[in-house]
């Protein structure tokens, strides 16, 4: 999606099928207020952005309302009347789902079910990553809805969990973004903890009677 024209790099993110953010990085125009012009229909006249993003006092992007659209964004980034970058993109291929909300944990012996609010569209994967201080890397499990059960946990260990949402590549293609991670939550013996110790505490020696 980057593509350079006159040294302009662009990035498109379609936040949760709600808002499209187009940002640009144009070293040649770093002290210039470039303008953003767009349309959702190839036959219409361009509209100018009304919600610019600023970086060091100069325009660096545009936010557009685009509720549940599955069509092409035609856009032109201009220096005055001179187009410095013109392109068209299918917005949905740059989807970034929103971060999971209302994350809940339900423990039953050596298993936990992680739930959260499902998003209002489909073909998503809800991924839970978890680890204990004994683990060298995060382990992962994902499902098509935000109802993920992880089994075989050690009740005595402290585990850190976080959750995110990903768009299925088979449907949305390879250029989407995963959601931001939810906050890390730590659990031990079915109870929430402030944190898991970074280094596992050695087992206490058994005292002989």
């Amino acid at each position: 999606q980057g593509g350079a024209a006159e040294g302009v790099q662009i990035q498109i993110i379609y936040f949760n099928l709600e808002t499209v953010q187009v940002t640009w990085n144009a070293s040649k125009y770093s002290r210039t207020n470039l303008t953003f012009h767009y349309r959702f229909n190839g036959d219409e006249a361009y509209d100018q952005c009304t919600n610019y993003l600023l970086q060091e006092g100069h325009t660096s992007g545009c936010l557009l309302d685009a509720e549940q659209r599955d069509d092409i964004l035609y856009f032109s980034i201009r220096n005055g009347t001179h187009p410095v970058f013109t392109a068209s993109r299918w917005m949905v291929y740059y989807l970034k789902p929103s971060s999971p909300k209302h994350v809940r944990f339900s423990w039953h012996q050596d298993a936990v079910t992680v739930t959260c609010s499902d998003l209002s569209y489909g073909d998503l994967l809800y991924e839970v990553q978890y680890r204990s201080p004994f683990d060298t890397e995060w382990q992962s499990k994902q499902e098509n809805t935000c109802n993920v059960t992880i089994e075989g946990l050690d009740a005595e260990k402290c585990y850190s969990f976080w959750v995110r949402v990903k768009a299925m590549e088979d449907v949305y293609g390879p250029d989407t973004y995963p959601s931001d991670w939810s906050e890390v939550t730590c659990w031990q013996r079915g109870e929430i903890r402030d944190a898991c110790a970074e280094t596992p505490t050695p087992p206490k020696p058994k005292l002989s009677k």
């Epitope: 949905v92 499902d118 209002s120 489909g122 809805t145 088979d170």
Partner: antibody
């Protein structure tokens, strides 16, 4: 609003091929949305077959993918469903429709075209 | 694949009756469910999407509810033109699947 008209149905022998067409009007199939085929066997329920997105990407029902191919002709604003190695159980009314990625429900439908696979 | 099971498969009702059709998914599908009405020889028509949102032009007597695995289509006061077959459909994950249909007949 978009209008969809299917054609190409008829009687075909098992093992043979058939190509269905769906002509869209009032909306360019390259401008947006997904363009699915859905079928319905006589007296039975509905089954999603495949779709082609306006970008050209395709997705299929895994149970049919090896035999069915979805395509389009942009200049004619027309979708196609190529069906190979047809079987008696492919006998159905085939509908084209419009949906969108992430929200794959079917808001607009054609009138359907009947395919009968019989010797 | 996700199975969508509708009940009843058919029902008889009179004009003015309140009619409820249920659809059960074999696993959670969030709120990603649509409902359609189909009359003999015609293409289906979208009634409800996202479990509870009426499609444009659909009369207010049609309503949908539910999330997860259990969904309901309600016709608050059955009209003569409502005698038809109704289908639910999940679009939470492909392959997108439909219920087997519920035929609403005149009593």
């Amino acid at each position: 609003q978009v209008q969809l008209v299917e054609s190409g149905g008829g009687v075909v022998q098992p093992g043979r091929s058939l190509r269905l067409s769906c002509a869209a009007s009032n909306y360019s199939i390259t401008s947006g949305y997904s363009w699915p085929w859905v079928r319905q066997a006589p007296g039975k329920g509905l089954e999603w077959v495949a779709y082609i997105h306006s970008s050209g990407r395709t997705n299929y029902n895994p149970s049919l993918k090896s035999r069915f191919t979805i395509s389009r002709d942009n200049s004619k604003n027309t979708l196609y469903l190529q069906m190979n190695s047809l079987r008696a159980e492919d006998t159905a009314v085939y509908y084209c429709a419009r949906s969108q990625l992430g929200l794959v429900f079917f808001a607009y439908w054609g009138q359907g075209t009947l395919v009968t696979v019989s010797s | 694949d996700i199975q969508m099971t509708q009940s009843p498969s058919s029902l008889s009702a009179s004009v003015g009756d309140r009619v409820t059709i249920t659809c059960k998914a074999s696993q959670s599908v969030g709120a990603n469910v649509a409902w359609y009405q189909q009359k003999p020889g015609k293409a289906p028509k979208l009634l409800i999407y996202s479990a509870s949102y009426r499609f444009s032009g659909v009369p207010s007597r049609f309503s949908g509810s539910g999330s997860g695995t259990d969904f309901t289509l309600t016709i608050s006061s059955l009209q003569p033109e409502d005698f038809a077959t109704y289908y639910c459909q999940q679009y939470n994950s492909y392959p997108y699947t439909f219920g087997q249909g519920t035929k609403v007949e005149i009593k």
